[in-house]
Interface confidence: medium
């Protein structure tokens, strides 16, 4: 369970491994704020709504974000 209920950073662990986009319910990018000084990327999986935190510095994660962004722009009119 990578989340906390505190008004601080959300993630407990971060992964360098990308998730399978087909298993993905949603992908949230939370910008740095007064509560958390770093960007957090939270992937919500379809199964049980499990949330996984991804390392924004990882090359594989950056590639995943590009792929998801490209897929979204294809879908939008």
């Amino acid at each position: 369970v990578p989340l906390s209920r505190t008004v601080r950073c959300t993630c407990i662990s971060i992964s360098n491994q990308p998730v399978n986009p087909r298993s993905l319910e949603k992908l949230e990018i939370i910008p740095a704020s007064q509560f958390c000084p770093r960007v957090e990327i939270i992937a919500t999986m379809k199964k049980k709504g499990e949330k996984r935190c991804l390392n924004p510095e990882s090359k594989a994660i950056k590639n995943l974000l590009k792929a998801v962004s490209k897929e979204r722009s294809k879908r939008s009119p």
Epitope: P2, C9, S13, I14, N16, Q17, R38, K48
Partner: antibody
Framework: QVQLVESGGGVVQPGRSLRLSCAAS????????IHWVRQAPGKGLEWVAV????????FYADSVKGRFTISRDNSKNTLYLQMNSLRAEDTAVYYC????????????WGQGTLVTVSS | NFMLTQPHSVSESPGKTVTISCTGS????????VQWYQQRPGSAPITVIY?????PSGVPDRFSGSIDSSSNSASLTISGLRTDDEADYYC??????????FGGGTKVTVL
């Protein structure tokens, strides 16, 4: 390979303090949430505390809240457990365990360090 | 508070199948994932099942996990029981976000 090595255990009197350490190697320590789990002699596993990869979040079992403090030094790849106001019921083997980076289970455990609280 | 209850012990002969139950109370067991840890005498625990029914690499397929929502329980099944399966087995899930809960453990004896 991944290694977690606990140290700092020993015999201590009730009411006193002790600090445990867990030296980590073989993985990206600064990405991983780490837990402390304890086991009283002849008893089951009891979750104690977890700290987030960057140290910004800490969670404790009710049985240790207010007495134990979990912390980490990512520059030294080391996890700590500061135990204050120790009680006889804190006597246990204390394990540090690494949370799998992209999942919800403890994929590596140390061998444990024994803390005995006795007068 | 969410609690997990396991039988204290189970025993079976080599080659047979044994199933260990882990029953939740105070909440729904299928709300969060369940893990199973094996602890041989004098050793640290290792994970044999994670996320309800997934096996880490290196764990034989004789180990399997399942969830039964109707009985609010999880189960660990060990088939083709071997003498080196003799150990304590613990289920684990979550009370609420980031509060971990272990079952009391089940001692598996191979007769």
């Amino acid at each position: 390979q991944v290694q977690l090595v606990e140290s700092g255990g020993g015999v201590v009197q009730p009411g006193r303090s002790l600090r445990l350490s867990c030296a980590a190697s073989g993985f990206t320590f600064s990405n991983s949430g780490i837990h402390w789990v304890r086991q009283a002699p002849g008893k089951g596993l009891e979750w104690v505390a977890v700290i987030s990869y960057d140290g910004s979040n800490k969670f404790y079992a009710d049985s240790v809240k207010g007495r134990f403090t979990i912390s980490r030094d990512n520059s030294k790849n080391t996890l700590y457990l500061q135990m204050n106001s120790l009680r006889a019921e804190d006597t246990a083997v204390y394990y540090c365990a690494k949370l799998r980076d992209n999942g919800e289970y403890l994929d590596y455990w140390g061998q444990g360090t024994l803390v005995t609280v006795s007068s | 508070n969410f609690m997990l209850t396991q039988p204290h012990s189970v025993s079976e002969s080599p080659g047979k199948t044994v199933t260990i139950s882990c029953t939740g109370s105070g909440g729904s067991i299928d709300r969060n994932y369940v893990q199973w840890y094996q602890q041989r005498p004098g050793s640290a625990p290792i994970t044999v099942i994670y996320e309800d029914n997934q096996r880490p690499s290196g764990v034989p397929d004789r180990f399997s996990g399942s969830i039964d929502s109707s009985s609010n329980s999880a189960s660990l099944t060990i088939s083709g029981l071997r003498t080196d399966d003799e150990a304590d087995y613990y289920c684990q899930s979550y009370d609420s976000i980031n509060l971990w809960v272990f079952g009391g453990g089940t001692k598996v004896t191979v007769l």
